[in-house]
C-alpha cells in the first residue's frame, strides 16, 4: 500500500508569492511559493495519485503583515481552502497567547490540529478540550493512518503560552500516545512536529511505533540529488534513522516559507511496516501556475493589508536616527528603539530566579535602512517601519559563549569607518572600543545586563558562560561576515518578524523617546 | 441527523444463534466506528467489540473471541453483529453505537435489541 | 483489562443538591474517560467526553473533573429529570470497559 505525504512547515505567514530569498515578491515573473501555487501542486498531485495525505507541521502564525492584520484567521482560511488533513502545533502558534491560537485557528480550522506534549491544566483545560488532540486517526483510501503530534518544549521561552498549559518531554509524551494507536490497530503512525531536526531524529529512534517523522522548527532543508534554488541540503531527503528497534524511519522537512512542498511516498507492507521510502521537495517556482480562485480570494483579502499599512502605530516625540551615516558608526536611538523592542518582545518571567530569561540584543547597523522624522505629527506607521526593515527577516533568540560575543564585537569594529553593516547596534550590553588598537584587539569593555538578579545591573562578559541573545535571522545566519556567530551558537529558535516586533513595541508604548544614551562607547 | 436504527427483539434457544442488524444514516458510513455493547438485565453495560466499516476492520473483547462475528455492508450502511453458541445469561439488550475511530466513547446509540435465550 | 470501580452503586438526593458520582481505572488511562446517563428502558445518552468536555445540548450543571486513576462527575444543582444511572467508560486500551454504574435516586 502506497501512501503520498505532502507536507509543510514553518511557512510563517507567506500567503503571497514571495522572491527566492522568501522576502516580498518584486519581479513577479522570479517568485515563488504562495497558497495559489501550493493549491495547484497539491490538485495536481491528488488528482494523479490516490492516497494523498496534505500535513503541516506548524509555525504557520507569524512573519508577514498578513499575521499583523489577520492574527491567523487567514492560516484557518487558507489552509481550509487547501483541504489540509493535519497540522501540528508549532511555538509560534502561540505568539497572540492561547486566546490567539483557539478563537481564530482552534475554533475555524475544518482540520485536526495535533500535539499530544502539550496538557493543559487549570480553567483553560475545559475552554481548551477537544479543540486540539494528541492524535487523530485519518482514513486514507481503504486503510488508517494515525498522526500524532508534537511541539517544543521550548515554547514557554520562544513564545507566549500562558501557564495553563505544560509543555512535556516529547519522547515521553508521545510514546503512550503511539501504543494507544497501536491498540487501535493502527499501523501506520506518521508523528507530525515541531520540535526542529535533531528532535525529529531522535523521535525517529526512541518512539516504539513511529513509521515515519514529518518535522519542522529548523527549517532543515534535505534534498536527494542536485538541489534546485539556493538552499544547501542538510541530509537526504528522506533522512533515514535506524531506530533503536532496527526499524528504518525516514525523517523529513521542508525548509519554510511555502517555498518547497515537501513530497514523499512511503510503500507499506499489509502488517505497516516501512518497505521503500523516496521522493524531494517540490520548489514552488514560477513554472507552477497560481490557482485562479485561490488567488483571487488572496487579492480580495489583501485589500485590508493595504488599509492598515497606512494607519498610525503610535508616535514619536524625537527623531528616529536610522541614518547609515550614525547606525554604521556610532551607537543611535533607532538601532536602540528596535533592540529595546526585540528584548521586550521577549520577556518571559518563568523562573522566580530570573527577571527574564534574557537580556541582550545586537543588531547589525547595517540592517537599519531608513530613520524617521518626528515632524510629520510624530506620526509612525508600519509603511515607515517597512522602510527601516524592509528585509521581512525575524528577530531571533540564541545561545552564544562569552567567547562569541566578544568575537562578533571585535568584527563589528574590525575595519571601522567605512560605512560597513557589521557595527553593531545594542541592548542591554555596554561596550567600550579602542580604535587605536589594532583589529582583532579593540574591545576593551564589555559588560552584559544580569539576568539572575532581581536589580538587573552590568557585569563584565564571562567568556566561558553562555548567554541568550536576541539578534536577527541575518545574523544568526552568519551574515555581515558574523561566521562566528553561525559556527559556534549553541542553540537558534527562529523568533517574530522584525516589523511586528517594532510596531507591536510602538503600539504598546503609544509615545516613544530613545535616546543615545551611552550603551556604545569610544575611549 | 445520525440514526442507528436497530432489527427487532429475538427469542433463541440455547446453542442457538443470532443476527442482530444496525442500519446507519444521517452521517458517513465508513468514517467511523460502530461498537457493540451490551446489558443483562438489572447489570451494567459490557462492550464486545467493534468494526470500522471503511475497512471491515473487526477488534473483539476477549471474553467474545470465537463466539461472535461482526460484518459490514457499505452499500445498505449496515453492521451486523452474529452471536453463536448461545447460552442463557446471552440474555440482554444488544446496542449498536457509533464511536470516533481513535477516540472510542459512543456518541450515538441504536435503541437496543432484546434478545432472550431460553429452552 | 482495565477495571473502571464507580462509587457510591446507589445514591439518594433531592432536587437542588450537588451530587458527586466518582471512577476509579486500575491504572492510568491518559484522560480517556466518559460519562453516560441512563433512564430506564433506554439507551445510555453520552454526556462527557475527554473527562470534561460536555456533549451539545447536555446542561452546563453537569462537569466531570480528575485525571490519571481518578475521575469525577458532579451534578451542581440536581433536577427530576436528572434521576437516573450514570455510567464511567474508559477508553484507552481495549477492551473498552465501564463502571458498574451508579443509581440516582429521589431521596
Known amino acids: 500500500w502506497e501512501l503520498t505525504i505532502l507536507h509543510t512547515n514553518d511557512v510563517h505567514s507567506r500567503l503571497e508569492q514571495t522572491s527566492e530569498d522568501s522576502s516580498k515578491c518584486v519581479n513577479a515573473s522570479r517568485c515563488m511559493g504562495g497558497v495559489a501555487r501550493l493549491f495547484t501542486k497539491v490538485q495536481q498531485i491528488r488528482r494523479a495519485e490516490p492516497n494523498v495525505l496534505l500535513l503541516d507541521a506548524g509555525d504557520q502564525y507569524q512573519g508577514t503583515i498578513w499575521f499583523t492584520v489577520y492574527k491567523g484567521a487567514e492560516v484557518a482560511h487558507f489552509m481550509n481552502a487547501l483541504r489540509y488533513d493535519a497540522m501540528a502545533l508549532g511555538n509560534h502558534e502561540f505568539d497572540n497567547g492561547v486566546e490567539g491560537l483557539i478563537e481564530p485557528l482552534l475554533k475555524e480550522a475544518k482540520f485536526p490540529i495535533l500535539s499530544a506534549n502539550i496538557k493543559a491544566k487549570g480553567p483553560l483545560a475545559s475552554q481548551i478540550s477537544g479543540l486540539y488532540l494528541p492524535y487523530k486517526v485519518l482514513p486514507v483510501g481503504d486503510e488508517v493512518v494515525g498522526i500524532v503530534g508534537y511541539t517544543s518544549k521550548e515554547t514557554p521561552f520562544l513564545s507566549n503560552p500562558g501557564t495553563n498549559l505544560v509543555f512535556e518531554d516529547e519522547i515521553t509524551a508521545l510514546q503512550p500516545e503511539v501504543d494507544k494507536l497501536k491498540t487501535l490497530n493502527v499501523n501506520k503512525i506518521i508523528a507530525l512536529g515541531h520540535s526542529g531536526f535533531e528532535m525529529d531524529k531522535l523521535i525517529a529512534q526512541k518512539v516504539r511505533g513511529v513509521d515515519v517523522v514529518v518535522g519542522g522548527h529548523s527549517n532543515t532543508f534535505l534534498y536527494t540529488g542536485n538541489p534546485p534554488s539556493k538552499e544547501v541540503p542538510a541530509g537526504k531527503y528522506p533522512f533515514i534513522v535506524t531506530s533503536d528497534d532496527g526499524r528504518k524511519v525516514p525523517v523529513v522537512q521542508a525548509y519554510a516559507f511555502g517555498k518547497y512542498l515537501g513530497y514523499l511516498k512511503i510503500e507499506f507492507d499489509e502488517r505497516g511496516n516501512v518497505i521503500s521510502s523516496h521522493g524531494n521537495p517540490i520548489l514552488l517556482n514560477s513554472s507552477i501556475p497560481e490557482d485562479p480562485s485561490i488567488k483571487a480570494d488572496i487579492n480580495k483579502w489583501r485589500i485590508k493589508l493595504d488599509n492598515y499599512s497606512t494607519q498610525e502605530l503610535g508616535k514619536t516625540i524625537v527623531y528616529l536616527d536610522g541614518s547609515s551615516q550614525s547606525c554604521r558608526f556610532r551607537e543611535c536611538n533607532m538601532g536602540n528603539l528596535i533592540c529595546d523592542a526585540m528584548i521586550n518582545n521577549n520577556l518571559r518571567h518563568t523562573d522566580e530566579m530570573f527577571w527574564n530569561h534574557v537580556s541582550m540584543c545586537i543588531l547589525n547597523g547595517g540592517g537599519i535602512r531608513s530613520p524617521i522624522d518626528e515632524r510629520n505629527n510624530g506620526t509612525i506607521t508600519w509603511e515607515n517601519l517597512a522602510a527601516v526593515l524592509p528585509f521581512g527577516g525575524t528577530f531571533d533568540l540564541v545561545q552564544l559563549k562569552g567567547s562569541t560575543l566578544k568575537k562578533a564585537f571585535e568584527h563589528s569594529v574590525h575595519r571601522y569607518g567605512q560605512s560597513t553593516g557589521e557595527f553593531l547596534q545594542v541592548g542591554g550590553i555596554h561596550v567600550v572600543y579602542d580604535l587605536s588598537r589594532k583589529p582583532g584587539d579593540r574591545v576593551v569593555k564589555l559588560d552584559v545586563l544580569c539576568t539572575k538578579c532581581r536589580v538587573p545591573s552590568y557585569d563584565p562578559l564571562k567568556m566561558d558562560e553562555v548567554y541568550k541573545v536576541i539578534l536577527p535571522n541575518f545574523l544568526a545566519n552568519g551574515g555581515d561576515g558574523f561566521q562566528m556567530i553561525k559556527d559556534e551558537l549553541l542553540r537558534h529558535d527562529s523568533g517574530d518578524q522584525d516589523i511586528n516586533v517594532v510596531s507591536t513595541y510602538i503600539s504598546k508604548m503609544k509615545v516613544i523617546y530613545p535616546a543615545v544614551e551611552g550603551r556604545i562607547k569610544f575611549s | 441527523q445520525v440514526q442507528l436504527v436497530q432489527s427487532g427483539a429475538e427469542v433463541k434457544k440455547p446453542g442457538a444463534s443470532v443476527k442482530v442488524s444496525c442500519k446507519a444514516s444521517?452521517?458517513?458510513?465508513?468514517?467511523?466506528?460502530m461498537h457493540w455493547v451490551r446489558q443483562a438485565p438489572g447489570q451494567g453495560l459490557e462492550w464486545m467489540g467493534a468494526i470500522f466499516p471503511g475497512n471491515g476492520h473487526i477488534s473483539y473483547a476477549q471474553k467474545f473471541q470465537g463466539r461472535v462475528t461482526m460484518t459490514r455492508d457499505t452499500s445498505t450502511s449496515t453492521v451486523y453483529m452474529e452471536l453463536s453458541s448461545l447460552r442463557s445469561e446471552d440474555t440482554a439488550v444488544y446496542y449498536c453505537?457509533?464511536?470516533?475511530?481513535?477516540?472510542?466513547?459512543?456518541?450515538?446509540w441504536g435503541q437496543g435489541t432484546l434478545v432472550t435465550v431460553s429452552s | 483489562d482495565i477495571q473502571m470501580t464507580q462509587s457510591p452503586s446507589s445514591l439518594s438526593a433531592s432536587v437542588g443538591d450537588r451530587v458527586t458520582i466518582t471512577c476509579k481505572a486500575s491504572?492510568?488511562?491518559?484522560?480517556?474517560l466518559a460519562w453516560y446517563q441512563q433512564k430506564p428502558g433506554k439507551a445510555p445518552k453520552l454526556l462527557l467526553s475527554g473527562v470534561i468536555s460536555l456533549e451539545t445540548g447536555v446542561p452546563s450543571r453537569f462537569s466531570g473533573s480528575g485525571s490519571g486513576k481518578d475521575y469525577t462527575l458532579t451534578i451542581s444543582s440536581l433536577q427530576p429529570e436528572d434521576f437516573a444511572t450514570y455510567y464511567c467508560?474508559?477508553?484507552?486500551?481495549?477492551?473498552?470497559?465501564f463502571g458498574g454504574g451508579t443509581k440516582v435516586e429521589i431521596k
Open positions: 491504572e492510568g488511562i491518559y484522560n480517556r
Open positions: 467508560q474508559q477508553y484507552w486500551s481495549i477492551p473498552w470497559t
Open positions: 453505537a457509533r464511536g470516533d475511530y481513535d477516540e472510542s466513547y459512543f456518541d450515538y
Open positions: 444521517g452521517y458517513t458510513f465508513t468514517t467511523y466506528n
